[in-house]
């Protein structure tokens, strides 16, 4: 049994890492595998993360982590039963994927202004409450070529666009990822997405 | 709320011994280590002792080595400290800590122990 | 054991100013080190920790920096609670040890 794909870890810097490999054949994750993982810091332990499939020859890993500091290092370790199969390490400020925003809802009823909104997936006490900045993705259902994207780089987590900007009497559907600049983070899942009718006045024309 | 608080303090004659107890709350106590540290009165911080999570590690200041036990139990939240052959240099407030990666994050009030005949 | 030497060891100071602190250590420790602030008959309470990160619910004007020897707490406008004893701690080795203080007090 040998490591085809060498593990690879994202962190949300919050509680959880993510790491996936793969194998040189098929192979049963969680019966075969462990991927023990311990924080360089003294006092620190080491922790069992019992792997799950991802396809036939891939595994994934999720690390339970119970904060995350810029300075953090963890040793990873991927056994085997006794067999030491790979050995490295890992630096979660180093790999971070910002978590999804949330909640993500578009308020129609302010005159002829789409108000989207969304939940910042941080509590204010960690450290990307404050630098995420967000990408907004609006589409049509009607329309596969009707596809925009909006830069939000405000803190603020909600969008205002003006209606007429999109077609009225079709729907439309909207999505949001967050990524941060400090930690020169990826792009975050997008967030589930929302339906709305567009609908609003055609201004009156005069001839 | 993190909270730890001492008990156990008390007078105890040189040779004596004592057992201190601090009880957390407002973590998931078994995940991380815990201290003790100790102060002199009208001195500064001294550092006596600490426990893995899991209590499977422990580790002593040499002034305590051999007499002091540091022990846990994740089922009551409960950290110990039994200090056997007390000496008048033991004499301090000693202060139970949450630890993490090394340092003290959250400190109890303290509970006094004067040796003394 | 990694001994800690903390300068000065008292500073009187006034409301408003800034007020800096250093810790040497007597070999490397990377940037594990804390900073403590201790108020007479009360615990001490973490300020700074892994040299330069705030513990949450500290103040701003409270900042930490330094890497291997040397080591800085700094508060830029000293404020009328921030009259204590500081002490520094490296959990680079065991046995942990401490400064042994600096007292900021009323000019």
């Known amino acids: 049994m040998k490591v085809l794909q060498e593990p690879t870890c994202v962190s949300d810097y919050m509680s959880i890492s993510t790491c996936e490999w793969k194998m040189n054949g098929p192979t049963n994750c969680s019966t075969e595998l462990r991927l023990l993982y311990q924080l360089v810091f003294l006092l620190s332990e080491a922790h069992t993360c019992i792997p799950e499939n991802n396809g036939g020859a891939g595994c994934v890993c999720h690390l339970l982590m119970d904060d995350v500091v810029s300075a953090d290092n963890y040793t990873l370790d991927l056994w085997a039963g006794q067999q030491l199969l790979w050995k490295g390490s890992f630096k979660p400020s180093e790999h971070v994927k910002p978590r999804a925003p949330g909640n993500l809802t578009v308020h129609t009823n302010v005159s002829d202004t789409l108000l989207l909104t969304w939940s910042n997936p941080y509590p204010p006490d960690n450290y990307l409450y404050n630098h995420l900045t967000y990408a907004v993705n609006i589409w049509s259902e009607n329309d596969p070529a009707d596809f925009r994207i909006y830069n939000v780089t405000y803190l603020e987590p909600s969008l205002r666009i003006a209606a007429s900007t999109l077609k009225s009497g079709i729907s439309y559907r909207a999505r949001v990822r967050a990524w941060a600049q400090c930690y020169n983070t990826t792009w975050s899942e997008w967030s589930p997405s929302t339906k709305w009718h567009n609908s609003y006045r055609e201004p009156f024309e005069q001839h | 709320e993190v909270q730890v608080l001492e008990s156990g303090g008390n007078l105890v004659q040189p040779g004596g011994s004592l057992r201190l107890s601090c009880a957390a709350s407002g973590f998931t106590f078994s995940s991380y280590a815990m201290s003790w540290v100790r102060q002199a009165p009208g001195k500064g911080l001294e550092w006596v002792s600490s426990i893995t999570g899991s209590g499977g590690s422990t580790y002593y200041a040499d002034s305590v080595k051999g007499r002091f036990t540091i022990s846990r139990d994740n089922s009551k939240n409960t950290l110990y400290l039994q200090m056997n052959s007390l000496r008048a240099e033991d004499t301090a407030i000693f202060y139970c800590?949450?630890?993490?990666?090394?340092?003290?994050?959250?400190w109890g009030q303290g509970t006094l122990v004067t040796v003394s005949s | 054991e990694i001994v800690l030497t903390q300068s000065p060891s008292s500073v009187s100071a006034s409301v408003g100013d800034r007020v800096t602190i250093t810790c040497r250590a007597s070999?490397?420790?990377?940037?594990?080190l804390a900073w403590y602030q201790q108020k007479p008959g009360k615990a001490p309470k973490l300020l700074i920790y892994i040299a330069s990160i705030l513990q949450r619910g500290v103040p701003s004007r409270f900042s930490g920096s330094g890497s291997g020897t040397d080591f800085t707490l700094t508060i830029t406008r000293l404020q009328p609670e921030d009259f204590a004893t500081y002490y520094c701690q490296q959990a680079n080795s065991f046995p942990f040890t401490f400064g042994p203080g600096t007292k900021v007090d009323i000019k």
């Open positions: 070999q490397g420790i990377s940037n594990r």
């Open positions: 800590a949450k630890d993490n990666r090394g340092f003290f994050h959250y």
